[in-house]
């Protein structure tokens, strides 16, 4: 059974994941982002279902494509390079979903833009956090 300390750790990890996803979205939605139109042409796979931590497998599988799109932004002017962000997100995702069980991700038929993709996973984090508090 989960202890209060493990629940607290999970909550903190989800909050960190949420914050980095939100910051990425802030950067993409920046009204002066000249690459936004190009970024929106890339398609991302969305999970058919995302209600449990194991479903983070679906996010993990899309992290490499996400990094590639983020690299379009402002190559010479990164405060945080996409590889720094994706590396941190990957570590959090692996810890949250665990590596013991193998979960085969099921994707929805429709693909999504990077904005829709990020918003979906932001909503996921917020939803799980709300069940822990």
């Amino acid at each position: 059974a989960p202890t209060s300390s493990s629940t607290k750790k999970t909550q903190l990890q989800l909050e960190h994941l949420l914050l980095d996803l939100q910051m990425i979205l802030n950067g993409i939605n920046n009204y002066k982002n000249p690459k936004l139109t190009r970024m929106l042409t890339f398609k991302f796979y969305m999970p058919k279902k995302a209600t449990e931590l194991k479903h983070l497998q679906c996010l993990e599988e899309e992290l490499k494509p996400l990094e590639e799109v983020l690299n379009l932004a402002q190559s010479k002017n990164f405060h945080l390079r996409p590889r720094d962000l994706i590396s941190n997100i990957n570590v959090i995702v692996l810890e949250l979903k665990g590596s013991e069980t193998t979960f085969m991700c099921e994707y929805a038929d429709e693909t999504a833009t990077i904005v829709e993709f990020l918003n979906r996973w932001i909503t996921f984090c917020q939803s799980i956090i709300s069940t822990l508090t």
Epitope: H16, Q22, M23, N30, Q74, H79, L80, N88
Partner: nanobody
């Protein structure tokens, strides 16, 4: 509007340590990047270290293994622990706050704090 209050600069001998702090206040996004850039006399401003509120970090190659960036999200404060300081670390260190992972015109910068490494 975001205000940045820096502290911790000063004179230190080569091999010594300093800790810089920067507290952000005002219209803060909870999701942000904060960190430190520096400018030595006659040189361009360069990245030292940046950390996101989610814990992602980026360090300049020249400070890796010597400097450590950390933050307290509850206080909107970022810290830079600088160890094994060298003469070439002498510069004005500027705190930076951004709502994005890359440079934007909406980024905020502190007034700067002088770090002098000299015997």
């Amino acid at each position: 509007e975001v205000q940045l209050l820096e502290s911790g600069g000063g004179l230190v001998q080569p091999g010594g340590s300093l800790r810089l702090s920067c507290a952000a206040s005002g219209s803060i996004f909870s999701a942000n990047a904060m960190g430190w850039y520096r400018q030595a006399p006659g040189k361009q401003r360069e990245l030292v270290a940046v950390i996101s509120s989610g814990g992602s970090t980026n360090y300049a190659d020249s400070v890796k293994g010597r400097f450590t960036i950390s933050r307290d999200n509850s206080k909107n404060t970022v810290y830079l622990q600088m160890n094994s300081l060298r003469a070439e670390d002498t510069a004005v260190y500027y705190c930076m706050y951004s709502g994005s992972y890359y440079y934007t015109p909406n980024d905020y910068w502190g007034q700067g704090t002088l770090v002098t490494v000299s015997s």
